[in-house]
């Protein structure tokens, strides 16, 4: 069986300020079991944007129903984009672990750029 791949099809996305940004991510397998998280940045200081398991992310909605059986689409939409939201976003799969989940595989990242609001 092929190992799970995390696919972020767009290398970059450009959105006008005030609009919503859709960041696409898909898995190629349901295995291993475990949550996905979205981060901005790739280093030790990366910022958590969305956690499938827990947390409060008022500006983030999932494009598909993540709890739906056999779902492989983990795309998100971030509302009311501002220039401060620019950056590279990573979709990351975690493997369920005890006591903590373990990072399994990351997508290649999608760079979000923000255009000035049309006047």
């Amino acid at each position: 069986e092929d190992e799970l791949q995390v696919i972020q099809p767009e290398k970059s996305v450009s959105v006008a300020a005030g609009e919503s940004a859709t960041l696409r991510c898909a898995m190629t397998s349901l295995i291993p079991v475990g949550p996905i998280m979205w981060f901005r940045g790739a280093g030790a200081g990366r910022e958590l944007i969305y956690n499938q398991k827990e947390g409060h992310f008022p500006r983030v909605t999932t494009v598909s129903e993540l709890t739906k059986r056999n779902n492989l689409d983990f795309s998100i939409s971030i509302s009311n984009i501002t220039p401060a939201d620019a950056g590279t976003y990573y979709c990351v799969k975690f493997r369920k672990g005890s006591p903590d989940d373990v990072e399994f595989k990351s997508g290649a990242g999608t760079e979000l750029s923000v255009r000035a609001k049309p006047s």
């Epitope: 981060f39 030790a44 910022e47 903590d100």
Partner: antibody, heavy 117, light 108 residues
């Protein structure tokens, strides 16, 4: 407004322990890495330790094996457990919020740790 | 570990003058270089990151330049509130995050 307030500093003898706390407010604590930086009297800044949003920990060589960083997301609080303290650990200890660019954009006012016999 | 060397150690400048000081890295950090300002008895304040991007609320008189191993912070016209110690920090993706030894900007 983002606020970071350190506490727990004081005077201890070499070999003793101390636990520092940093209470955070004004941002979603769970979504950011947080770090400790120290400054010995009259000296420059020295990075000490960082804990990521997923709980991964990093340490400077000078404190590895003696200091433990941790976070309680339910309390929006960062901790630094300092064991086997040495005179050279004497410093003001600052906690700071870490941006996704790995820079420190908000700092507390610091808490003074003095290690002396 | 990347070592950052700042020069000069102290810079004496008159208000209204231009101040320029440097930070040299022992190995390349690309553009991952930040600058902080610290006044006596206060916490450091982030000024610049990614070598030349001003942090939120930082006046335009502060500018950063450089890449690789050589970086410069310039204050175009020194105000009284700018007299302080300035530290550079490399912010590559992974720790340790090292700081330079600092440059003290004092009134001439």
């Amino acid at each position: 407004d983002v606020q970071l307030v350190e506490s727990g500093g004081g005077l201890v003898r070499p070999g003793e322990s101390l636990r520092l706390s940093c209470a955070a407010s004004g941002f979603t604590f769970t979504n950011y890495a947080v770090t400790w930086v120290r400054q010995a009297p009259g000296e420059g800044l020295e990075w000490v330790s960082l804990i990521s949003v997923t709980g991964t920990t990093y340490y400077a060589d000078s404190v590895k094996g003696r200091f433990t960083i941790s976070r309680d997301n339910s309390k929006s609080t960062l901790y630094l457990q300092m064991n086997s303290l040495r005179a050279e650990d004497t410093a003001v200890y600052y906690c700071a919020k870490v941006t996704w660019k790995n820079v420190f954009d908000y700092w507390g006012l610091g808490t003074l740790v003095t290690v002396s016999s | 570990e990347i070592v950052l060397t700042q020069s000069p150690g102290t810079l004496s400048v008159s208000p209204g003058e231009r101040a320029t000081f440097s930070c040299r890295a022992s190995q390349t950090v690309g553009s991952k270089l930040a600058w902080y300002q610290q006044k006596p008895g206060q916490a450091p304040r982030l000024l610049i990151y990614d070598a030349n991007t001003r942090a939120t609320g930082i006046p335009a008189r502060f500018s950063g330049s450089g890449s690789g191993t050589e970086f410069t912070l310039t204050i175009s016209s020194l105000q009284s509130e700018d007299f302080a110690v300035y530290y550079c920090q490399q912010h590559t993706d992974w720790p340790p995050y090292t700081f330079g030894g600092g440059t003290k900007v004092e009134i001439k």
